[in-house]
């Protein structure tokens, strides 16, 4: 019990004067708090708290659930406590079955004892299943059993608190451990397309996929050099434990030229951040730009071959391509193909293969191409010696 030094407020005095008290179920609990400035008794066990404004706490017929910490507080905010165990052979554990553990942290299995003198207070797997070999614990009869440094592999582990009573194991109700994973890497982010080219009025929609171990990963779409909040929609899935996926879709229903720019999908967790960008270019109307791959004036010798080659950019996609000579369209001898198989490709190649040219086949060869918005053409002047 606290000793009183004159002039300084001292903690209250409790009778009986011991830190722990063991009573049998059905017996009386009588606790007296002596202090001129008595304020209240507080009882705590698990998440339950009760108060009593009388300085004598009396429980006529003690039950196992009266096991807990009884604290007397005075007007100076000073307190003193006694822990009471109500020994009940039929109820050895008090239990709060919620059990969450953060990976790499300790977590408490809340199964305080009603009898501190039982032995072998430990954990057992459900239905005789073994516990993980690397699981370690620290017992505390007043609080429960602390599992040290929770591992991800313990997720959904079913366990009981266990004691030995008269040579037999007694198990508590079962607990299921839910493990909240720790972030040990940055989120994985990817984007549906790295660049977009649109005409004014078309819809811009881009999806960012964020993958991480849990849904507490943060993600957002940002426009570079802008603070404007973008409208995004989310879909998310848990593909089993510790495999979370979110799709964040950014949409501009009617894109304008001034919407052009770089959009960033940013994600972060407690480990770090990651981002991926996509570029949007909005044009007021479609276009075609043609680039000759050889000089447009060509000199060849009689009987020689020549290939007339152009590259061109077309947006939207080219709809009609033709090579013309003397108002006649070539039906063969030419090929047209995309420069790459990338779905954002806007660059194409067209080749006209002229073989064993005669002196009479000189003249102007024209390549024409069109899409839904524009037409374009380029002419080659071929001289046969």
């Amino acid at each position: 019990q606290p000793s009183v030094s004159p002039g300084e407020p001292s903690p209250p005095s409790i009778h009986p004067g011991k830190s722990d008290l063991i009573v049998r179920v059905g017996d009386e609990i009588r606790l007296l708090c002596t202090d001129p400035g008595f304020v209240k008794w507080t009882f705590e066990i698990l998440d339950e708290t009760n108060e009593n404004k009388q300085n004598e706490w009396i429980t006529e017929k003690a039950e196992a659930t009266n096991t807990g910490k009884y604290t007397c507080t005075n007007k100076h905010g000073l307190s003193n406590s006694i822990y009471v165990f109500v020994r009940d052979p039929a109820k050895l554990f008090l239990v709060d079955r919620s059990l969450y553990g953060k990976e790499d942290n300790d977590t408490l299995v809340r199964c305080p004892l009603t009898d501190p003198e039982v032995t072998n207070y430990s954990l057992k797997g459900c239905q005789g299943k073994p516990l993980p070999k690397d699981l370690r614990f620290i017992p505390d009869p007043k609080a429960g059993i602390m599992i040290k440094s929770v591992k991800r592999a313990y997720h959904r582990l079913c366990l009981h608190c266990s004691v030995d009573q008269e040579g037999k194991s007694v198990l508590s109700e079962k607990f299921i451990l839910k493990v909240r994973p720790a972030f040990k890497a940055v989120p994985v982010v990817s984007v549906s397309k790295a660049s977009y080219l649109l005409r004014e009025g078309e819809e811009f929609t881009v999806t960012c996929t964020i993958k991480d171990v849990s849904s507490s990963v943060y993600s957002t779409w940002k426009r570079e050099n802008s603070q404007t909040k973008l409208q995004e929609k989310y879909n998310s899935w848990h593909h089993g434990d510790f495999n979370y996926e979110r799709q964040a879709t950014l949409t501009i229903s009617s894109a304008r030229v001034n919407d052009s720019g770089v959009f960033m999908c940013y994600a972060n967790n407690t480990f770090g951040s990651a981002n991926v960008t996509t570029t949007l270019e909005v044009v007021d109307k479609g276009f075609i730009n043609i680039f000759p791959m050889i000089n447009t004036t060509v000199f060849v010798n009689d009987g020689e071959n020549v290939d007339l080659i152009v590259e061109y950019e077309a947006f939207p996609k080219p709809e009609h391509q033709q090579w013309i000579y003397m108002n006649r369209t070539f039906t063969d001898k030419w090929e047209d193909y995309p420069k790459s198989e990338n779905e954002s490709n806007i660059r194409y190649v067209s080749e006209l293969h002229l073989t064993r040219l005669k002196g009479t086949e000189g003249g102007t060869y024209t390549f024409l191409v069109s899409n839904s918005d524009v037409n374009a053409a380029i002419a080659f002047n071929v001289y046969v010696n």
Epitope: P116, T119, N120, Y121, S122, L123, L131, P132, K133, L135, R136, F137, I138, P139, D140, P141, K142, M146, K148
Partner: nanobody
Framework: EVQLVESGGGLVRAGGSLRLSCAAS????????RAWFRQAPGKEREFVAA????????YYPNSMKGRFTISRDNAKNTVYLQMNSLKPEDTAVYYC??????????????????WGQGTLVTVSS
């Protein structure tokens, strides 16, 4: 690191008693699990008793319960093993073990990190 030193072993007649001590020094404040194991010649190391330093929970195999009692003195950083009604088959080297926490299988000697050198207990008939 923690150092463990056992004492109290010796020769005793069957039916007699002995009290073994295990004094810990070093970074002892973090070591909550203290245990006694024993090893008889040609046999595997066997769990005898354990105690939680902070909570005072005790652990025994059924075969030792009643005859052996483990206790602690926090002020002296010492764990005791009181052995009563000793039998010749209790003859062994008794080892003290410690760790920061108890393994789920607290009777498995391989899961304890720190060990003393051992003290020999001989029970004559």
């Amino acid at each position: 690191e923690v150092q463990l030193v056992e004492s109290g072993g010796g020769l005793v007649r069957a039916g007699g008693s002995l009290r073994l001590s295990c004094a810990a020094s070093g970074r002892t404040f973090t070591y909550d699990a203290r245990a006694w194991f024993r090893q008889a010649p040609g046999k595997e190391r066997e769990f005898v008793a354990a105690i939680s330093w902070s909570g005072g929970s005790t652990y025994y195999p059924n075969s030792m319960k009643g005859r052996f009692t483990i206790s602690r003195d926090n002020a002296k950083n010492t764990v005791y093993l009181q052995m009563n009604s000793l039998k010749p088959e209790d003859t062994a080297v008794y080892y003290c073990a410690a760790d920061e926490s108890f393994p789920a299988y607290y009777s498995d000697y391989a899961l304890y990190r720190y060990w003393g050198q051992g003290t020999l207990v001989t029970v004559s008939s």
